[in-house]
């Protein structure tokens, strides 16, 4: 067998660091069987079978002019074998990041803090970790190491699923590299992490017969679950064309009537999602969707709105009944602070 | 010869904006995190910002979240810091710096002076 | 985030004496510790990484030791061109925090 160990990576390459002295390994001959190594394509002896070194080629201080393949002969000039000399350097801690979509799964993602220039794989395991005694804040690594599977075609990725929202874990990213491994640890908690996605679907319709009011709708992220335990809350931004500034309201449920907009112009509407009782942090806007109010006269039978904002409107005084709310019941961890039945809304 | 040097620095009003820029010379700038530190007028050393090699993950001091916008040009080895609503707390001298493993920084520009005044 | 303190905020020393200054986490944090050197007007520098390792080109005099929470560093013979504030730096998550900094002179 070979007395040279095989460092993960491709077979024949042989790897060291920069301004490090560096050995090389004959890998076709016995342990100290005396050696002579040249650089492939050059007759020039670096080492003679006289070093005192056995199978071993020693670079001092080696840089980049030494990189490439090497031979060793022995003794009676039969092929002792070829290696590769790569140079690079032992893997740093990687910069590690993980995030929440919902509250049953999050990911972490990672980059390397720095390039080592040499073959490189990444492990990764979390374990769930429990609070130590009733009333004890100490926590310690309790349940797993479990993998974090990775995310196929090399995206540097892992998904854990099933997570407990209450629970902490510590994320575990070793870098590997021929030189060694690095590891990066991250406590997360899901509550912190969360960030739903944006709402999806969202219309902006005008309200016949009301300059100044646009009725905007939308739905749940299809990435938050279908039964949701956790309600989401939102936040509407509005905004006439070519104005700068937005102005801002939380909508009770998944529609909201604005009813300030300014007559005959275009208004950008855009929405935000967050939970329901402020873990994590808000959603990315949605992409903006855009509306005119209407230019017409009353009609005669008056659509049904969702809680609306009483600004002064040259308007009559109109009573209309809510649409129903989604039907997402609420976990037993919140109680829902709005009515269980909406009030008429009163039109101003 | 490895160094940074940073520039960009100067006089601004409260909300204004500046973007500073650290340029690296004598090492592979792109195998390396980099890193923006900042030192008030008498005070102690800040950690404001960093970057991994691709650009792909950035982290900021809470106290320039979503102000302040760190990024880098690989191809020009050029790493840029865009402050934004500047306020006269954010007067310092900014220093660009070479972590080793995200945070041991062995290598430092001479800085810039940023001054937020009205 | 991580908080660090050191002691003492400043001192004053002969020259050739032995110069020591504490520096404490508020939580454990390896190893990922280090120490620098500043002087008036200029970048700091680093003099010693991962608590106790001496940093290329650093004199022999400057040490460090700790680990967790708790971290020490020495001047064994204090030089006139020692003359500078020393700041503990921990990297043991994403967002490095300094020490307030010592500031070292002469008596």
């Known amino acids: 067998s070979s007395p040279c160990p095989q460092a993960w990576g491709p077979p024949g390459v042989q790897y060291g660091q920069p301004g490090r002295s560096v050995k090389l390994c004959c890998p076709g001959v016995t342990a100290g069987d005396p050696v002579s190594w040249f650089r492939d394509g050059e007759p020039k002896l670096l080492q003679g079978p006289d070093s005192g070194l056995g199978h071993e080629l020693v670079l001092a201080q080696a840089d980049s002019t030494d990189e490439g393949t090497y031979i060793c002969q022995t003794l009676d000039g039969a092929l002792g074998g070829t290696v590769t000399l790569q140079l690079g350097y032992p893997p740093a801690r990687p910069v590690v990041s993980c995030q929440a979509a919902d509250y049953e799964n999050f990911s972490c993602t990672w980059s390397p803090s720095q390039i080592s220039g040499l073959p490189t794989r990444y492990l990764t395991s979390y374990r769930k970790k429990t609070v130590l005694g009733a009333d004890s804040q100490r926590r310690s690594p309790s349940t797993g190491p479990w993998p974090c599977p990775q995310d196929p075609l090399g995206a540097a990725r892992c998904v854990v699923h099933g997570a407990e929202f209450w629970s902490q874990y510590r994320i575990n990213v070793t870098e590997v590299n021929p030189l060694g491994a690095s590891t990066r640890l991250l406590d997360v908690s899901l509550q912190s992490i969360l960030r739903p996605d944006p709402p999806q679907g969202l219309r902006v319709e005008s309200v016949p017969g009301y300059p100044r009011r646009l009725r905007a709708s939308w739905t749940y992220p299809a990435s938050w679950p279908c039964q949701p335990h956790f309600l989401l809350k939102f936040r509407l931004q509005y905004r006439p064309a070519q104005h700068p500034a937005w102005s801002t309201v939380e909508p009770a449920g998944l529609e909201e009537v604005i009813t300030d907009a300014v007559a005959g112009l275009p208004h950008a509407v855009r929405v935000s999602a967050r939970d329901f009782l402020d873990a994590g942090t808000w959603s990315t806007w949605s992409p903006e969707a855009w509306g005119t109010p209407s230019t017409g006269t009353i009609p005669k039978e008056i659509p049904a709105w969702g809680q609306l904002h009483t600004q002064p409107e040259v308007e009559p005084q109109v009573d209309s009944p809510a649409p129903p709310r989604p039907s997402l019941q609420p976990h037993p961890r919140l109680l829902d602070h709005r009515d269980s039945v909406e009030q008429v809304a009163v039109l101003a | 010869e490895v160094q940074l040097l940073e520039s960009g620095g100067g006089l601004v009003q409260p909300g204004g904006s500046l973007r500073l820029s650290c340029a690296a010379s004598?090492?592979?700038?792109?195998?390396?995190?980099m890193t923006w530190v900042r030192q008030a007028p008498g005070k102690g050393l800040e950690w404001v910002s960093s970057?991994?090699?691709?650009?792909?993950?950035?982290q900021y001091a809470d106290s320039v979240k979503g102000r302040f916008t760190i990024s880098r040009d690989n191809s020009k080895n050029t790493l840029y810091l865009q402050m934004n609503s500047l306020r006269a707390e954010d007067t310092a001298v900014y220093y660009c710096?070479?972590?080793?493993?995200?945070?041991?920084?062995?290598?430092w520009g001479r800085g810039t002076l940023v001054t937020v005044s009205s | 985030d991580i908080q660090m303190t050191q002691s003492p905020s400043s001192l004053s020393a002969s020259v050739g004496d032995r110069v020591t200054i504490t520096c404490q986490a508020s939580q454990d944090i390896n190893n990922y510790l280090n120490w620098y050197q500043q002087k008036p007007g200029k970048a700091p520098k680093l003099l010693i990484y991962?608590?106790?390792n001496l940093q290329t080109g650093v004199p022999s005099r400057f040490s460090g030791s700790g680990s967790g929470t708790d971290f020490t560093f020495t001047i064994s013979s204090l030089q006139p061109e020692d003359i500078a504030t020393y700041y503990c730096?921990?990297?043991?998550?994403?967002?490095?925090?300094f020490g307030p900094g010592t500031k070292v002179d002469i008596k």
């Open positions: 730096q921990q990297y043991d998550n994403l967002s490095p925090t």
């Open positions: 970057i991994v090699p691709s650009g792909g993950h950035t």
């Open positions: 991962d608590a106790s």
């Open positions: 004598g090492f592979t700038f792109s195998w390396y995190s």
């Open positions: 710096a070479k972590p080793h493993d995200w945070g041991r920084f062995d290598l």
